[in-house]
């Protein structure tokens, strides 16, 4: 990112550049690799987001693959198509012309196939299940204690509305976030649960996407909250789509 | 006032290189999108890429990729745009142009004509 | 990519004429953050550079003559020309800067009978 004259920053997202060349000479902020203009104001898409990762200079990128164990985004990352609004396209190809649907968090839904595969809709991802595994500490953290403070973490950091974090749940060292969100509850200007994930997913990682902010600082009654492992399971509207040799596989 | 000087006409042979350069004055070079435009002879407009001076990020459209190298030079406030392999449907007038909503200012244009 | 496609192609009209120049997106311009539609309109006359008519779909740049006025949002726009004079012969472009790569419209050609 670069801070192109004084106070023309976005703050929400680095992966930006910013100029004085809005209309009116304002400040505009676009993200790297798709040049849309994005709200400063909120969370930048994950889509865009993905897209400015991959777009980066290779000696900067980090290629980060989750888990084994994990039950969806195993594909590592990919350079997504992202439509005007900076959502998610439902079909993704790559360069060999191999195609897959995805869902609103762009994880792969589908058996790959190849250009006459077709996407019908964006599935909407409503709920997330966010595993984390802590540090050993001397004893459990307070379960309203840990509850209340990443309740505020989401609210406060990711300007996600209370109402869409359905609960904290913890068997230490295992915390579980739940968030859910259905279509009909997403009112405009409203923060994705999706993208409220990814920047949760990249601040736990130590990646933080905001600019010049320190990196994510969790604490439950001053007792640091070090995360050792996460996964993330994603839940669609409509069940994803994939053949039984993969499922018995 | 903003204003974009490209360097003058060239005439190369196919397999050449060529390199247009375009010196920017009147504004902060570094903190604005520079983009290159080609036109045909009699032909439209096409977007090539673009680069922002102050930290050399640059985009390039897909179709000018390998033909195409953007660069800038903030010491002198002037970017430059490399056409390698020339052939003859390289020829054609190439414009660089300030982008952005208030994007009223470009270069007069550079012929470049390819001939044997 | 964004395909613009305008229409139409050519057109002669009479000096006090009203003109109008349609430009379709195949995908929406209309940035949902801001609500800024990324579409411009650019005049070309022989031997010049494009000159920048309109920004953000309607906003007219300033020295550009009242008689240019821009409209639509989404994938529609237009220009309009209210009283066309001897000085406006010349190559209309429409173009978006929403996502790269930027596109224009293929050019309307505007003459006088």
């Known amino acids: 990112h670069t801070a192109a004259q004084d106070n023309c920053t976005c703050p929400t997202n680095k992966m930006t550049v910013c100029s004085p060349d809005g209309p009116g000479g304002r400040c505009q902020c676009r993200a790297l690799g798709s040049g849309m203009a994005v709200d400063c104001s909120t969370l930048t898409s994950k889509c865009l987001l993905l897209k400015a990762r991959m777009s980066a200079p290779k000696n900067a990128r980090t290629l980060v693959r989750p888990s084994e164990h994990a039950l969806v985004d195993n594909d590592g990352l990919y350079d997504p198509d992202c439509d005007p609004e900076g959502r998610f396209k439902a079909r993704q190809c790559n360069q060999t012309s191999v195609c897959w649907c995805v869902n609103s968090v762009g994880v792969r839904r589908t058996d790959k196939g190849d250009l006459s595969l077709r996407c019908d809709e964006l599935v909407r991802t409503h709920h997330i299940l966010i595993d984390l595994r802590h540090r050993p500490t001397a004893g459990a953290f307070n379960h309203s204690d840990l509850d209340a403070e990443l309740r505020r973490l989401f609210r406060e950091r990711y300007r996600l509305h209370p109402k869409f974090v359905a609960a904290v749940h913890y068997e230490q060292p295992t915390i579980q976030i739940e968030l859910r969100q259905n279509t009909s509850q997403k009112a405009a200007g409203d923060v994705d649960i999706g993208d409220a994930a990814y920047y949760f997913e990249r601040d736990i990682k130590g990646e933080s996407l905001f600019q010049g902010r320190g990196g994510l600082d969790l604490r439950v009654r001053g007792e640091p909250l070090q995360v050792e492992r996460t996964l993330i399971y994603y839940l669609d509207e409509i069940p994803p789509k994939f053949s039984m040799k993969r499922l018995t596989a | 006032q903003v204003q974009l000087v490209q360097s003058g006409p060239e005439v190369k042979k196919p397999g050449a290189s060529v390199k247009v350069s375009c010196k920017a004055s009147?504004?902060?070079?570094?903190?604005?999108?520079l983009g290159w435009v080609r036109q045909a002879p009699g032909q439209g407009l096409e977007w090539m890429g673009n680069?922002?001076?102050?930290?050399?990020?640059?985009n390039y459209n897909e179709k000018f990729k390998g033909k195409v190298t953007i660069t800038a030079d903030t010491s002198t406030s002037t970017a430059y745009m490399e056409l390698s392999s020339l052939r003859s449907e390289d020829t054609a007038v190439y414009f660089c142009?300030?982008?952005?909503?208030?994007?009223?200012?470009w270069g007069q244009g550079t012929l470049v004509t390819v001939s044997s | 990519d964004i395909v613009m496609t305008q229409s139409p192609d050519s057109l002669a009209v009479s000096l006090g004429e009203r003109v109008t120049i349609n430009c379709k997106s195949s995908?929406?311009?209309?940035?949902?953050?801001?609500?800024?539609?990324?579409l411009a309109w650019y005049q070309q006359k022989p031997g010049q550079p494009p000159k920048l008519l309109i920004y953000g779909a309607s906003t007219r740049e300033s020295g550009v003559p009242d008689r240019f006025s821009g409209s639509g949002s989404g994938t529609d726009f237009t220009l309009t020309i209210s009283s066309v004079q001897a000085e406006d012969v010349a190559v209309y472009y429409c173009q978006s800067d929403h996502i790269y790569p930027y596109t224009f419209g293929q050019g309307t050609k505007l003459e006088i009978k």
């Open positions: 680069i922002f001076p102050g930290s050399a990020y640059i």
């Open positions: 009147g504004y902060t070079f570094t903190i604005y999108w």
């Open positions: 995908q929406s311009l209309l940035n949902s953050g801001n609500q800024q539609n990324y």
């Open positions: 142009a300030r982008e952005g909503s208030n994007s009223g200012y």
